[in-house]
Amino acid sequence: ECVTQLLKDTCFEGGDITTVFTPSAKYCQVVCTYHPRCLLFTFTAESPSEDPTRWFTCVLKDSVTETLPRVNRTAAISGYSFKQCSHQISACNKDIYVDLDMKGINYNSSVAKSAQECQERCTDDVHCHFFTYATRQFPSLEHRNICLLKHTQTGTPTRITKLDKVVSGFSLKSCALSNLACIRDIFPNTVFADSNIDSVMAPDAFVCGRICTHHPGCLFFTFFSQEWPKESQRNLCLLKTSESGLPSTRIKKSKALSGFSLQSCRHSIPVFCHSSFYHDTDFLGEELDIVAAKSHEACQKLCTNAVRCQFFTYTPAQASCNEGKGKCYLKLSSNGSPTKILHGRGGISGYTLRLCKMDNECTTKIKPRIVGGTASVRGEWPWQVTLHTTSPTQRHLCGGSIIGNQWILTAAHCFYGVESPKILRVYSGILNQSEIKEDTSFFGVQEIIIHDQYKMAESGYDIALLKLETTVNYTDSQRPICLPSKGDRNVIYTDCWVTGWGYRKLRDKIQNTLQKAKIPLVTNEECQKRYRGHKITHKMICAGYREGGKDACKGDSGGPLSCKHNEVWHLVGITSWGEGCAQRERPGVYTNVVEYVDWILEKTQAV
């Protein structure tokens, strides 16, 4: 059962796993959610009735029954982890805590103009978990405007104390705001010989890399495969760090793989979601339950639905035994990973999918692309919406993309002459315009947010957000697309598609069925040559064939230029403008979304 509200002046008795320090009960709840075993927590707020050494303590708790006895205690705030909830969760915390000093290892001290600059410094420093900034009003003259970058083993402060005229906050790496290099390579036959901060068992290097990414201290990893000569080290995932943040020594060793934390590539890759099945593989751990199940997929579902289950092993039924049902072993451990991995015993193992909601919804798999043809099929582009105006009569106005459960990203030029959001309707999960009838459900628009530097499409800033009146429930036919991550600025996208119900030639009409076209990206330099009379800025991106023939056109505006990279779809562009449609040597010009990620996050995450 999902309980989101916090219980004031209430303490949960017993079940303690560990104690951490957090600046608020809200953040304590997030820490509990991300902890592999925590189901409940008790936070102690600052209070004159409470011993100051206990202020800001966040006690993480577990219980077989998923609840614990409640006791009244002033200044205690208790609650439940979001593991029990189906909504999406994020570790991103932009809050700034005034008059709080979050203690950790102070490894870097420098002068900064503001707390925001200090936070940016922390976000762009590979080791930084959180910071404390002494403001201009700080009593000690030589400490004023000093920005202290800090880290700890757990990623949370070792203590929090009251201190006048300082502010503290966390790194925004988990908000996808880091400019640190994103290094995606996995190096075969490589061991990184730096200090290990932790080790876990993993079935493959990809799971090992994802564990490294969400481990607060891990910067790179080495994984020993099941063919590794030393039996005791097989499937061992070594989580590593170094002072420089980079591996100091690389040793060539067969059957080992090494790679990097993807913390600066966040939001465009699944980090928590290990969705693969591992055949002829048994995961060992503490047994939670043994249940009969028809298949390994059914076993994974059972594990996902059992809040304490972290991973499972399924043993298929022996012929005609137990109505063809096999045994599903639901398991857990202290760190969420198997305690041992065995091969050759016939089991099929995997992980709970409960943690997938901690990844951006946009990273989950969608229907495979239909190759050839120009008409899309249902569910092929689940982020694509059709934006209708009802004035003077109802018609398709523009395309748009779902980027959050209350947010559509589209083009600013769509709203020329639109006086009020009241006349707009957003339809999602639509393949054919003819499906839209009087009684078809739609999302009303609460607010239109147009970039304040927008003047006209050709001069850039052609971007707008629509805040919906109600939230979108994600399904196979309506779900978000990932924004490109700033850490991925240098990805060269080769699989890009433009979609929309727009004209198929310059003088035409809106199409009934959603159309798609695969279109190559064009360098800005090449694009500039084709548009001598315009300035093609870095905030624009171009796509098109030199010979023309495929392009976006009238009515596609605001829709997505979607590019697939590492099995994840990214919203690389927003259909903006072009000279004619599909003309030779006249590529389409799109808003370059990666350049507006900060703007999008600022507008969508504003309180």
Epitope: A181, I183, S248, R250
Partner: nanobody, 124 residues
Framework: QVQLVESGGGSVQAGGSLRLSCAAS????????VGWFRQAPGKEREGVAA????????YYADSVKGRFTISQDNSKNTVYLQMNSLRAEDTAVYYC?????????????????WGQGTLVTVSS
């Protein structure tokens, strides 16, 4: 003593090409970030291209994408910047820099070691 030495600069017509080299002594490019930066008169130093030498991951400023290519020769401990389709606005002193930490690849403030620079002049 760490030394980075740039070479290959000079004058070229718009549309032409140049190849800059950066040779290091006392510092190994392997396992580190190496960047090319430039500074035009009266302007701030800006990142042009960077490479993480271990895997060869490359990073480029939008203004040079598709025109400039950064590459490395680990055996010679040298990094190159191939510059094609040069424009007048590419005129600047080009610096090679080495980082000793994981960095935002095009942020000059985070690089530790710097060369003396080589002048590139593009005339239109």
């Amino acid at each position: 003593q760490v030394q980075l030495v740039e070479s290959g600069g000079g004058s070229v017509q718009a549309g032409g090409s140049l190849r800059l080299s950066c040779a290091a002594s006392g510092y190994t490019f392997n396992n580190n970030f190496v960047g090319w930066f430039r500074q035009a008169p009266g302007k701030e130093r800006e990142g042009v291209a960077a490479i993480y030498s271990l895997g060869g991951s490359t990073y480029y400023a939008d203004s040079v994408k598709g025109r400039f290519t950064i590459s490395q020769d680990n055996s010679k401990n040298t990094v190159y910047l191939q510059m094609n389709s040069l424009r007048a606005e590419d005129t600047a002193v080009y610096y090679c820099a080495g980082a000793i930490t994981w960095v935002p690849p095009l942020s000059h403030r985070r690089y530790t070691y710097w060369g003396q620079g080589t002048l590139v002049t593009v005339s239109s």
